[in-house]
């Protein structure tokens, strides 16, 4: 069993609107039809799962129903958005790729992605 | 296959000393971390020590000067040198291996680092009593 590589971002900047997008990418060193995927957050020397999915190559990932990801698949590449983020929920993103079927299963951890959210200033009062 | 089995867990009084070793194999990382995890009765499972594939090694606060992990490359085992053993340390002890040296030596010190893991063995207990 080998070890396989996952990339991703370094840094991403989170929109206005809560809104950040990365690209998990992994190398699969075999021909995977079930794949697995974990989002997990690390700050303040505690690493909690945000959200996971596990799809079927070719078809589209299903996230809960309450779960604050969603995303798209195409070859090795997973396209992630997590909405709904505040400034507290700054910190690193790290990108947990399994290969559940055929065995052997396959494991790959991301370096993770810096996920910045600056919480838009409210509108000040006008008179007008 | 990735197969570890642990061995080396038992009884033993207050103060005393145990060698947990964790044999490994069907894995062929370059760079990896090998991790000592433990599992008290209740709780959840968290880091006790850590090392990766260039030697270093990180400790749990709690286990600090008292636990020493060890990697012998060329039986691709891992070791657990437990001395002064308290009540708490009461738990069971699983190896555990990591495919990103990145998160290595945080891990002893990180609630949840089991996520930066995949491949566990079953487990031997340590209990700790007089």
């Known amino acids: 069993c080998k070890a396989m590589h996952v990339a991703q971002p370094a840094v991403v900047l989170a929109s206005s609107r809560g809104i950040a997008s990365f690209v998990c990418e992994y190398a699969s060193p075999g021909k995977a039809t079930e794949v697995r995927v974990t989002v997990l957050r690390q700050a303040d020397s505690q690493v909690t799962e945000v959200c996971a999915a596990t799809y079927m190559m070719g078809n589209e990932l299903t996230f809960l129903d309450d779960s604050i990801c969603t995303g798209t698949s195409s070859g090795n590449q997973v396209n992630l958005t997590i909405q709904g983020l505040r400034a507290m929920d700054t910190g690193l993103y790290i990108c947990k790729v399994e290969l559940m079927y055929p065995p052997p299963y396959y494991l790959g951890i991301g370096n993770g992605t810096q996920i910045y959210v600056i919480d838009p200033e409210p509108c000040p009062d006008s008179d007008f | 296959e990735v197969q570890l089995v642990e061995s080396g867990g038992g009884l033993v009084q207050p103060g005393g000393s145990l060698r947990l070793s964790c044999a490994a194999s069907g894995y062929t990382y370059s760079r990896h971390c090998l991790g000592w995890f433990r599992q008290a009765p209740g709780k959840g499972r968290e880091a006790v020590s850590t090392i990766d594939s260039d030697g270093s090694t990180s400790y749990a606060d709690s286990v600090k000067g008292r636990f020493t992990i060890s990697r012998d490359n060329a039986k691709n085992t891992l070791y657990l040198q437990m001395n002064s053993l308290r009540p708490e340390d009461t738990a069971v002890y699983y190896c555990?291996?990591?495919?990103?040296?990145?998160?290595?030596?945080?891990?002893?010190?990180?609630?949840?680092?089991?996520?930066?893991?995949?491949?566990w063995g079953q487990g031997t207990l340590v209990t700790v009593s007089s």
């Open positions: 555990a291996i990591g495919p990103n040296p990145r998160y290595c030596s945080g891990a002893p010190n990180t609630r949840g680092a089991e996520h930066y893991f995949g491949y």
